[in-house]
């Protein structure tokens, strides 16, 4: 079995590697404002700009728990949002060039890119000191859906440059005195 | 699918080291702390400590303090556990497990039997 | 270290039975309690942490509970796969340990 997503107790879901991440809505989590890899966003359409379209990537900053402890420090993640739509041209089946139009195949906002980040834990009671290892999504990017496909086999939008490993998981732990540093971000 | 294939049995003589293997597949290693945990014959589980592959950092039991240390090659998923001046009492079966934390232990290796005999 | 004491050490049921097992901390560990189940020959495999957290794909018959010093794995309905051994382990303080084991029989 591999890893699934994670309910560390009744108040979040931590997502499972090889899952895409939808975290819940929480108190102490704050949106951002969307990001296109520091791009404005652009509508998936827009005939001027022949650049590959990306969709957008929300920023959300929250503090994970595990049982009745809680991070540290609050993490930032991304979810990966928005419509995905072609902004560049693509050959038909003649030769031609032409854009996708809204009826043709369906595009999906997912993720990209991953990294791992290392929790520092807070417990109750003067417990050891605890760690745990998180995946969070990087960056986020569209993937086309054919009809001759069902729904989850995605198609690459484009070229990509890294592709998240698949069937793998996270999840966290308790932390070494010789650690000091609190968090470890590592794109992957 | 996560999985952790560990090194075939070993005999040691006392006073000897030994290194199993653990090669980890369905996720990356460096994504997960690595715990080491050991049986002895119809005994109960010790846990022996754990690692963390990314930056290296390790936490061992008292016990096995200056005896064990954890590696890992990240480049090829495998974990590493080596303990040194080996006794009789050092015979038992010797658990690979993973996690996303420091102190539970998600998935388990097969095990490896290692015997101390002179 | 924090010592766990199990109870009992073996005990013999039958299919379908409620079966309860104790784990007793030497200190208080607060929540930080997990259960594992062993078959002969085979490695542990978790089953609740957080003292009362089910890890994934763990059948909804086991179920435990407790806080400070007392905890408690019940099997709501042993199952002819549910024979073996189970262990709670501690990580409130270093170093992790775990209770001597509690061995669940066919009667």
């Known amino acids: 079995q591999g890893w699934q997503a994670f309910r560390n107790d009744a108040t979040e879901v931590i997502p499972g590697l090889g899952e895409y991440p939808e975290p819940p809505p929480e108190n102490n989590q704050t949106m951002n404002r969307a990001e296109n890899g520091g791009r404005p966003p652009h509508h998936p359409y827009d005939a001027k700009d022949v650049s590959e379209y990306s969709c957008r990537e929300l920023h959300y900053t929250r503090f994970l728990t595990d049982g009745p402890c809680r991070s540290a420090k609050p993490v930032t993640e991304l979810v990966c949002s928005g419509q995905c739509g072609p902004a560049r041209l693509l050959p038909n089946a003649i030769g031609r060039v032409k854009w996708w139009r809204p009826n043709g195949p369906d595009f999906r906002c997912i993720p990209d890119r991953y990294r791992a980040q290392r929790v520092q834990l807070l417990c109750p009671g003067g417990a050891a000191p605890r760690s745990r290892k998180v995946r969070l999504v990087a960056s986020c990017k569209c993937k086309r859906l054919t009809r001759f496909h069902n729904q989850s086999e995605l198609k690459d939008f484009g070229p990509e440059t890294a592709r998240p490993q698949k069937g793998r998981k996270p999840r966290p732990g308790a932390r070494g005195a010789k650690a000091n540093q609190a968090e470890l971000e590592n794109a992957y | 699918q996560v999985q952790l294939v560990q090194s075939g049995a070993e005999v040691k003589k006392p006073g000897a080291s030994v290194k199993v293997s653990c090669k980890v597949s369905g996720f990356p290693i460096k994504h997960h702390f690595q715990h080491w945990v050991r049986q002895a014959p119809g005994k109960g589980l010790e846990w022996m400590g754990w690692s963390d592959p990314e930056i290296g950092d390790t936490e061992y039991a008292s016990k096995f303090q200056g005896r064990v240390t954890m590696t890992e090659d990240t480049s090829t998923d495998t974990a590493y556990m080596e303990l040194s001046s080996l006794r009789s009492e050092d015979t038992a079966v010797y658990y690979c497990?993973?996690?996303?934390?420091?102190?539970?232990?998600?998935?388990w290796g097969q095990g490896t039997t290692v015997t101390v005999s002179s | 270290d924090i010592q766990m004491t199990q109870s009992p050490s073996s005990l013999s049921a039958s299919v379908g039975d409620r079966v309860t097992i104790t784990c007793k901390a030497s200190q208080d560990v607060h929540t930080a309690v997990a259960w594992y189940q062993q078959k002969p020959g085979k490695a542990p495999k978790l089953l609740i942490y957080?003292?009362?957290t089910r890890w994934t794909g763990v059948p909804s018959r086991f179920s435990g509970s407790g806080s400070g010093t007392d905890f408690t794995l019940t099997i709501s309905s042993l199952q002819p796969e549910d024979f073996a051994t189970y262990y709670c382990?501690?990580?409130?303080?270093?170093?992790?340990?775990f209770g001597g084991g509690t061995k669940v029989e066919i009667k």
């Open positions: 382990q501690q990580y409130s303080d270093y170093h992790w340990t």
């Open positions: 957080w003292a009362s």
């Open positions: 497990a993973t996690g996303d934390t420091t102190y539970k232990f998600d998935f």
